[in-house]
């Protein structure tokens, strides 16, 4: 079982390989000096049907370096960054993992593109492995709450409350959504 020639790349090069390309072979892409690689640089020859070989993902692309490009902080509810830090310049990558009891959908890594957007795929999503969700928490008088998403919230996520200036928070500042679908505490209050 073998793979066909790896997909070509404009303004870049492909690592050395010999033919036939055996299943398990890795080829690596890189870009010429003034270009930046967007996408996974390594492709793996795999077989899905034990008959034909195929490459496990599309080839990355080489974008002409844009020194003015910068991308916003990427947020994945239920996830956290394991690689990458601000500022995010053209060609920089960020890799995510999901919190405990969350599973990932999509590709774990994204790249800062010349158009100031993350790509070449969408940001991954972290989905709760528990079907239960906690109901949306109410806003509080003279205060606010921040949550990683809106509406009902998956177990493992939390909501942080704060009070407007001149008010004191009474109760729990951070409330966690438990795997039971219940909140770890009642909302606090803001008192003068």
């Amino acid at each position: 079982i073998s793979c066909g020639s790896p997909p070509p790349i404009l303004n870049g090069r492909i690592s050395y390989y010999s033919t036939p390309i055996a299943v398990g072979t890795v080829i690596r892409y890189s870009c010429s000096g003034t270009f930046r690689l967007i996408g996974e640089k390594s492709l793996l020859c795999i077989t899905k049907d034990k008959v034909d070989g195929t490459w496990d993902k599309p080839a990355p692309k080489c974008e002409y370096f844009n020194k003015y490009s910068s991308c916003p902080e990427p947020i994945v509810p239920g996830g956290y960054k394991i690689r990458g830090s601000t500022p995010y310049r053209h060609g920089d990558s960020v890799t995510f993992a999901c919190k405990t009891n969350f599973s990932m959908n999509g590709n774990k890594s994204v790249w800062c593109q010349a158009n100031n957007m993350w790509g070449p795929t969408r940001l991954p999503t972290c989905v709760s492995v528990f079907p239960l969700e906690c109901p949306a928490l109410p806003m509080i008088h003279n205060g606010h709450h921040t949550s990683e998403n809106v509406g009902s919230i998956a177990p493992g996520l939390s909501v942080t409350y704060s009070c407007e200036s001149g008010y004191l928070l009474v109760g729990e500042k951070i409330i966690n959504c438990l795997s039971s679908g219940k909140w770890s505490a009642v909302p606090p209050t803001c008192e003068e």
Epitope: S15, Y16, R28, S42
Partner: antibody, heavy 119, light 106 residues
């Protein structure tokens, strides 16, 4: 950080086989590649082959083709390397080493297993 | 297979001084090169990957450079714990290691 713990030292007779295990803890076993690298006494490092557990695909260095078999058990997060038709030149420390995805370089190594081939 | 050649076989340097280790590939390997440190009785430890990127937790005194066929590992100011054997490894086409350079105290 992923921890790789290998089985203990072995003494074998020429012509026999040896099977060394490498148990991984931390990280997702099936998403990375495990290579086997050996080091004869006072010598350098020699790549033998590698397996990608999620795919069950193993590839071998030309030198060891037909004599080495690398397998993985995803349920126990353990990789195995079996070397057959042992000869005295196979006396070495055998290491398992982990690549994150298919990066090509090894972030984590087992502690090594000494295999001595002697009559 | 791609042959990796390291030089010198042994390098004697005094603590606090700079050490420069070389690695040559038998054909172009782009930047697909890693450096490892190995101390007696221990497994190798990743220092550098992609020719010049320091691995997590590796001190800034270690730096890598080069691309194509010529690569260098530089240790800017040698500490006592840096005396060890250093290996380069290519991952352009499968995997091969250099024969190692022993860095010893002068």
């Amino acid at each position: 950080q992923v921890q790789l713990v290998q089985s203990g030292a072995e003494v074998k007779k020429p012509g026999s086989s040896v099977k060394v295990s490498c148990k991984a803890s931390g990280g997702t076993f099936s998403t990375y590649a495990i290579s086997w690298v050996r080091q004869a006494p006072g010598q350098g490092l020699e790549w033998m082959g590698r397996i990608i557990p999620i795919l069950g695909i193993a590839n071998y260095a030309q030198k060891f083709q037909g004599r080495v078999t690398i397998t993985a058990d995803k349920s126990t997060s353990t990789a195995y390397m079996e070397l057959s038709s042992l000869r005295s030149e196979d006396t070495a420390v055998y290491y398992c080493a982990r690549e994150d995805d298919i990066s090509g370089y090894y972030q984590d190594w087992g502690q090594g297993t000494l295999v001595t081939v002697s009559s | 297979e791609i042959v990796m050649t390291q030089s010198p076989a042994t390098l004697s340097v005094s603590p606090g001084e700079r050490a420069t280790l070389s690695c040559r590939a038998g054909q172009s390997i782009n930047s697909h090169l890693a450096w490892y440190q190995q101390k007696p009785g221990q497994a190798p430890r990743l220092l550098i990957y992609d020719a010049s990127t320091r691995a997590t937790g590796i001190p800034a005194r270690f730096s890598g450079s080069g691309s194509g066929t010529e690569f260098t590992l530089t240790i800017s100011s040698l500490q006592s714990e840096d005396f060890a054997v250093y290996y380069c490894q290519q991952y352009e086409y499968w995997y091969t290691f250099g024969q190692g350079t022993k860095l010893e105290i002068k």
